[in-house]
């Protein structure tokens, strides 16, 4: 089956004809399967010692692992990651704002391992088990 | 400035050039800003009263709106939202399998909106003010 | 509460120097900066300079050579101090504060007339 | 130093009116703009800042929305108190710039 963009996902749904398309069993999974996918991420998560200060923008598109494994079991994590360096406005209170450089680590590449504990059904993770 | 695919961010930093490359100012900015993007989100998320059941894949991947909006004062909220219909499988303990269609809700027009109390700040939003 | 006050004369010769006193209360000027803006009669708003927080200070191109703005941290004063006034200076000079965005409060205004 | 146009300078509107007032930056300024409110005699107000962060005390019939180089000021219902003048200011690059202002008038 060709693949289908999921911003088209919400238009074929809603297309008007009486016949709702589906989206194949197929295209399902194989969005939904571990990979390395776009995730905004707070900058003072990464550097929350810089917590009094604000950044411009707030957050960073980064890609990490996520997805689902297809065994409760397993789940999705990173097993090679790149450093990515992005220039952002740092505002002091009061001050004058700045450029800075910051560098945040991406998931390159992502895989489906076991849960250290084979306990905690984990149905969907964000490279980190659900509880 | 070009934009560049965030697959490749972390590549152009480990070139293996003494310089890093550091993605400029205007492509963070445009890349973080409140819009509609891929997740993937647990099935018994959407569906609880099915948690009972499993479900392959246990997540699908949906488009919700989540960026930043440049003030901790605003947060990214859906204004536009479409059904989108996919084929699962459902697992019942001990039983066979079965296919089914479920119904999702995806986020197709973002906007920044005033967070209701101008207090709390909200540095990265996934349309949800961060406590 | 937070307040700024201005104080500073409402008549000035021609040639002479302009000089504004914004004194704050209810905040730090270690924290926020202070910005200096001008209305003259009939105009818009116009943006002349700024004491940030750090003390670094920030001019519009038109006026560099002819402001400056200075601050004393321990008094929450800051100073506004232009020179070689003319007539079209006249009009009404405001401070306001600034943390991370808009100005969010401003000084009573100080009205100034150019005449001899 | 980057521009700040105000499409209209004045507009004639009646009490309970939807009034959208525009502004446009010469460049691209990420959301650091702001509205303000004057009234005569009286200093601006700010009312809204990072392109539609309603400050405290501002009546939520204000409303901002906007990015990249065009911005705008909504009133949903326009009270009698809302008669003023209403400027536009971008604060990504010294110099901060102001718009020319647009007044409102009841008709």
């Known amino acids: 089956l060709p693949a289908v963009p999921p911003q088209q996902w919400a238009l074929s749904a809603g297309n008007g004809s009486s016949e709702v398309e589906v989206v194949p069993f197929q295209e399902v999974w194989g969005r939904s399967y571990c990979r390395a996918l776009e995730r905004l991420v707070d900058v003072v998560s990464e550097y929350p010692s810089e917590v009094e200060h604000m950044f411009s923008p707030s957050c960073v598109s980064l890609l990490r692992c996520t997805g689902c494994c297809g065994d409760e079991n397993l789940h999705c994590v990173p097993v090679e990651t790149a450093n990515v360096t992005m220039q952002l406005l740092k505002i002091r209170s009061g001050d004058r704002p700045s450029y800075v450089e910051l560098t945040f680590s991406q998931h390159v590449r992502c895989e489906c391992r076991p849960l250290r504990e084979k306990m905690k059904p984990e149905r969907c993770g964000d490279a980190v088990p659900r509880r | 400035l070009p934009a560049v695919p965030p697959q490749q961010w972390a590549l152009s930093a480990g070139n293996g050039s003494s310089e890093v490359e550091v993605v400029p100012f205007q492509e963070v900015w445009g890349r973080s800003y409140c819009r509609a993007l891929e997740r993937l989100v647990d099935v018994v998320s959407e569906y609880p009263s099915e948690v009972e059941h499993m479900f392959s894949p246990s997540c699908v991947s949906l488009l919700r709106c989540t960026g930043c909006c440049g003030d901790e004062n605003l947060h990214c909220v859906p204004v536009e939202t479409a059904n989108v219909t996919m084929q699962l499988l459902k697992i019942r303990s001990g039983d066979r399998p079965s296919y089914v269609e479920l119904t999702f809700s995806q986020h197709v027009r973002c906007e920044c909106r005033p967070l209701r109390e101008k207090m709390k700040p909200e540095r990265c939003g996934d349309a949800v003010p961060r406590r | 509460q937070v307040q700024l006050k201005q104080s500073g004369p409402g008549l000035v010769q021609p040639s002479q120097s302009l000089s504004i006193t914004c004194t704050v209360s209810g905040f730090s000027l270690t924290t926020y900066g202070i910005h200096w803006v001008r209305q003259s009669p009939g105009k818009g708003l116009e943006w002349l300079g700024v004491?940030?927080?750090?003390?670094?200070?920030d001019y519009d191109a038109a006026f560099i050579s002819r402001l400056s703005i200075s601050k004393d941290n321990s008094k929450s004063q800051v100073f506004f101090k232009m020179n070689s006034l003319q007539a079209n200076d006249t009009g009404i000079y405001y401070c306001a504060r600034y943390r991370f965005y808009g100005m969010d409060y401003w000084g009573q205004g100080t009205s100034v007339t150019v005449s001899s | 130093a980057i521009q700040m146009t105000q499409s209209s300078s004045s507009f004639s509107v009646s009490l309970g009116d939807r009034v959208t007032i525009t502004c446009k930056a010469s460049e691209d300024i990420y959301n650091r703009f702001a509205w303000y409110q004057q009234k005569p005699g009286n200093a601006p107000r700010l009312l809204i800042s990072g392109a539609a962060s309603l400050e405290a005390g501002v009546p939520s019939r204000f409303s901002g929305s906007g990015s990249g180089q065009d911005y705008t000021l909504s009133i949903t219902s326009l009270q009698t108190e809302d008669v003023a003048t209403y400027y536009c200011?971008?604060?990504?690059?010294?110099?901060?710039?102001f718009g020319g202002g647009t007044k409102l008038e009841i008709k």
């Open positions: 200011q971008q604060y990504w690059s010294t110099p901060w710039t």
């Open positions: 004491m940030w927080s750090g003390g670094d200070t």
